[in-house]
């Protein structure tokens, strides 16, 4: 039975050319996390593997950075980065937990950042 829950940064906005931290946190389960995937629609952004560590998808190697923690930092944002992002926790024995974040990249300098998410 899957008892865990994923908290995310939710809906966030950022300014074009800036950077943003995508953050998820899995709680309420003792399942072992074997890997965490970050995906944008069907495109792989990054993987954090429990044994091998971080892998940034080569297409994004110049503007995606691992962390903090199991989160992901997107840099040099463009309007095309607007959309849904998913953190996918692969765990044993529970299975897969998925969190969703919607990022809006704004042209204006009045981009309102969502509250900075803190891992408890």
């Amino acid at each position: 039975m899957m008892t865990g829950t994923i908290e995310t940064t939710g809906n966030i906005s950022a300014e074009k050319g800036g950077s943003i931290i995508l953050q998820c946190h899995l709680s309420s389960t003792t399942a072992q996390v074997t890997q965490v995937n970050w995906e944008q629609q069907d495109q792989l952004l990054a993987i954090c593997n429990a044994d091998l560590g971080w892998h940034i998808s080569p297409s994004f190697k110049d503007r995606v950075a691992p962390g903090p923690g199991l989160g992901l930092t997107l840099q040099s944002l463009t309007v095309n980065d607007t959309g849904e992002y998913f953190c996918i926790y692969h765990t044993y024995p529970d299975g897969t937990y998925t969190g969703r974040i919607f990022l809006e990249v704004l042209e204006s300098s009045v981009a309102e950042h969502g509250a900075r998410f803190q891992i408890p």
Epitope: L44, P58, K61
Partner: antibody, heavy 126, light 109 residues
């Protein structure tokens, strides 16, 4: 400690079929790795032949023009290479290798070939 | 077919810095890997994903990538570093994987 050991005939006749096997110890052939074949003609550089994932997915060097087939035998914890229509140009040292990946489910996120066999020499001659 | 281009040879004196380059059109969006092959031995992975060093590889080995060029740097080359070095990557569609032609590093002892 993971070890790979190639085996097969040292001499193959032209137009024949080359069959090589790589025995895996210290790791399961069903684990999340690409199992690879690489060759090196005498005095030349390395050439990637192809690879197979535990799911059965395969990738091949297009230069082989469909002459190559890589397969896995889970019961024997080994994988194999078959190369048909052999010519003298296929004379080489053949290596098997394990390539680790970050995404254990799909094989995405290539880490690199971190364990290699010692190589086996194959000569094509009549 | 996709090609990775390396210089055939590089020579340094012991203690000097050796730099081996690898150029390929897809490298801005692909990773470079570097393998060391000493005479009569199987290759050894010394750098993966442009700049990561596997455990057991000396710190004098480092990698970098900029644009269409990847570089393997050996800071303070030692006689035992004399070997052939091959870069390795993928084409723009992800497969096939391909080796560069190899670079023979001579450490003039």
């Amino acid at each position: 400690q993971v070890q790979l050991q190639e085996s097969g005939p040292g001499l193959v006749r032209p137009s024949g079929t080359l069959s090589l096997t790589c025995a895996v110890s210290g790791d399961s052939i069903s684990s999340s790795n690409w199992w690879s074949w690489v060759r090196q003609p005498p005095g030349k550089g390395l050439e990637w032949i192809g690879e197979i994932y535990h799911s059965g997915n395969t990738n091949y060097n297009p230069s082989l023009k469909s002459r190559g087939t890589i397969s896995v035998d889970k019961s024997k914890n080994q994988f194999s290479l078959k190369l048909t229509s052999i010519t003298a140009a296929d004379t080489a040292v053949y290596y098997c290798a394990r390539a680790r990946v970050y995404d254990i489910l799909t094989g995405r996120g290539y880490y690199g070939m971190d364990v290699w066999g010692q190589g086996t020499t194959v000569t094509v001659s009549s | 077919s996709y090609e990775l281009t390396q210089p055939p040879s590089v020579s340094v004196s012991p203690g000097q810095t050796a730099r081996i380059t690898c150029s390929g059109d897809a490298l801005p969006k692909k990773y470079a890997y570097w393998y060391q092959q000493k005479s009569g031995q199987a290759p050894v992975l010394v750098i993966h994903e442009d700049r990561k060093r596997p455990s057991g590889i000396p710190e004098r080995f480092s990698g970098s990538s900029s644009g269409t060029m990847a570089t393997l740097t050996i800071s303070g080359a030692q006689v035992e570093d004399e070997a052939d070095y091959y870069c390795f990557s993928t084409d723009s569609s992800g497969n096939p994987r391909v080796f560069g032609g190899g670079t023979k590093l001579t450490v003039l002892g």
